[in-house]
Every structure is written in C-alpha cells, then in structure tokens.
Interface confidence: medium
C-alpha cells in the first residue's frame, strides 16, 4: 500500500460531500465521478505519468471548476504534477490526448504543469514533485 497522503500541517482539508459515495479502490479518493490518487513521494512528470498508467489512470485531467477547486484544496501548499504538457511545436495537451483550450491561465514558461492551492503553473519536467492521478469511476 502506498498509504494515504498527509496534508501539510498548515493546511486543513475537508473531504467533499460526495467522496464517500465512490467506486474507488483503497488509497484513492472519489470525487465528481472520478477516482484520484495523490502521491506521497516525488517524481519527474514522465515518471509520475508512468506511475499513474500502472493503475489504469493518467496524471490528472482537470475538466471542470469543481475539479480544479477540489485539487487545489487537496494539494495544499505543495506542488503537484497534473496531466498537462507542451511538446515542442505542439499545443498544450492533456494526458488523455485532448488539446488544452485555455480555460484557465498557466503561468511560467516551462513545459509541464503543476498546481498547488494558490496557482497553476509550469515547471521543468525533470523536477521531482508530488503528483495527482485520476481515472473515471469503474
């Protein structure tokens, strides 16, 4: 078992109201018909994506304001990789293959995206950060 994610001491997280009504396996949290896993160790963006895929998931695809707010709360002050990346000569793409449609602003000038409770930004993909996976309910 990878264990549960320990939120930083300076941040309090309340479980969303629908989190208990889920079809998610142990160590995963259900929200808005998706299962989420928040890592307890740090990896590069690519290694994190590989870790997600081993569980039939991808780095988190954020496709609604509710999801965004949920993940920012969950991430707290720590930086977490999510599934948005820009390959040279290509548009920003989510880890599910969808082109990003600029519905939120990504700061920074690097190629891989992370979030924390106050921002969504980009960083060099080789940096080791916590990460968030998601996949649809079974």
């Amino acid at each position: 078992s990878v264990g549960q994610y320990n939120c930083p001491g300076q941040y309090t997280f309340s479980m969303p109201s629908d989190s208990h009504v889920s079809s998610c396996s142990e160590d995963w949290v259900g929200y808005q018909r998706k299962c989420y896993f928040i890592s307890t160790v740090k990896r590069s963006w690519t290694s994190a994506q590989n870790a997600c895929s081993e569980h039939g998931a991808t780095l988190a695809v954020i496709d609604s304001e509710k999801d965004m707010n949920f993940l920012k709360r969950y991430a707290g002050r720590e930086e977490h990789w999510v599934g948005l990346k820009k390959e040279p000569g290509h548009p920003w793409k989510w880890s599910n293959g969808k082109e990003f449609n600029n519905w939120f602003n990504v700061t920074g000038s690097d190629k891989c995206v992370f979030l924390k409770n106050t921002e969504v930004s980009s960083m060099e993909c080789e940096k080791n950060l916590y990460w968030i996976c998601n996949k649809p309910y079974k």
Partner: antibody, heavy 106, light 108 residues
Amino acid sequence: VQPGGSLRLSCAASGFTFSNFVMHWVRQAPGKGLEWVSSISGSSSSTYYADSVKGRFTISRDNSKNTLYLQMNSLRAEDTAVYYCARYYYASFDYWGQGTLVTVSS
Amino acid sequence: DIELTQPPSVSVAPGQTARISCSGDSLGSKYVYWYQQKPGQAPVVVIYGDSKRPSGIPERFSGSNSGNTATLTISGTQAEDEADYYCGSYTTGAKSHVFGGGTKLTVL
C-alpha cells in the same frame, strides 16, 4: 451605420468575477449560423480575431467597470449581424448576452 | 484550421431518439460543445466538454466525440427540443473558435 463607418459595442457583465474570465464576441448574420469574432484574456494581455475582422475590429475590456467592448471600424454590409458577448469557461461559452443587432447599410 | 460540418436538418418523431453529427479533421483531439438556439433567443449550451451536461439541461441530452465525429443525442425527444443546434470547438492553441453550420431539428 453606413458602410465604412464605425461603431463601438459594449457588454456590461455582472454576477461573476469578470477579470477571471476570457471573454468573446460571437455574431450571427440574419438567418445564418454562429460566427466567432474575437476574444480577450482576463488581463487583456492576449487578444485574438477572426480573419474576417482582423485589422478592422478591436476588442478591449475595462475590468474596473466589468465591461467588454468591441470597436468596429471600416464596417461592411457583411458585418450586419446580431453581436453577442459571451463568457468562455472550461469548454464552452456558458453565458451569453441578449445580443445587439448591427445593421450596415447605405 | 478545423472546419465543422453538420447536416442542415434532422427530423424525429416525438419520443424517438435524435442524433446530430458534427464532423471535422481529428475532432476527437479537441473538446466539443453543443448549443441549442430557439428563434429570437441567444444560444444555450446543452453539452460541453464532449459529454458534460450543464445543470438544468435534461438528462435526455448526451454527447460523444471520437475520431473525426462528435454526436449530440437527444433521447425521448420532446416538442420543446425543436430548435437549431450548433456544435463548436477551438483551433490549435485555442486562438480561435469555430462553429458548425447548424442543424435544424424538427419534431414531427
């Protein structure tokens, strides 16, 4: 307005934090389909235009007044349409203005 | 840039299922939204993000998108669903947006 003339449209927004959202103008010629016209980022740092209006129309916003603008110059008959302002969020234009009819004719 | 193609009209009997297609090159790699527009009114989004339904939109509206085709499905079509329907998406880099030509849905 007559061909070659100018006009400025405004769109007053309320009920949400205006500066946080990308805003767009979309138009619809009488009896025709929807046509995207222009967009502007929340901070006004990025603006984009359809080829059909590039160089003639200018989109802007005043976040202190929660207002979106479209300055239309060198108007043509084919610019005749109902112009809608619309908020863009996640993956759709989720809120639309009621529309303003602009008629360009001599 | 991407072009979206819709059938000009679709007819369906009340209670039956209506399907409206929207095709474009590699459309499945982008998110698609669908609007309903009734005469004299502004468009209303009925599906966004390929298949998500805004609150207040009846469950009979659903959407899908894969390959080169997105589809709006209205199950158990009602007379009030008679309207023009437009699909929409965005170009690479989301620097512009494009709409299909619209489909007039007639409930017989």
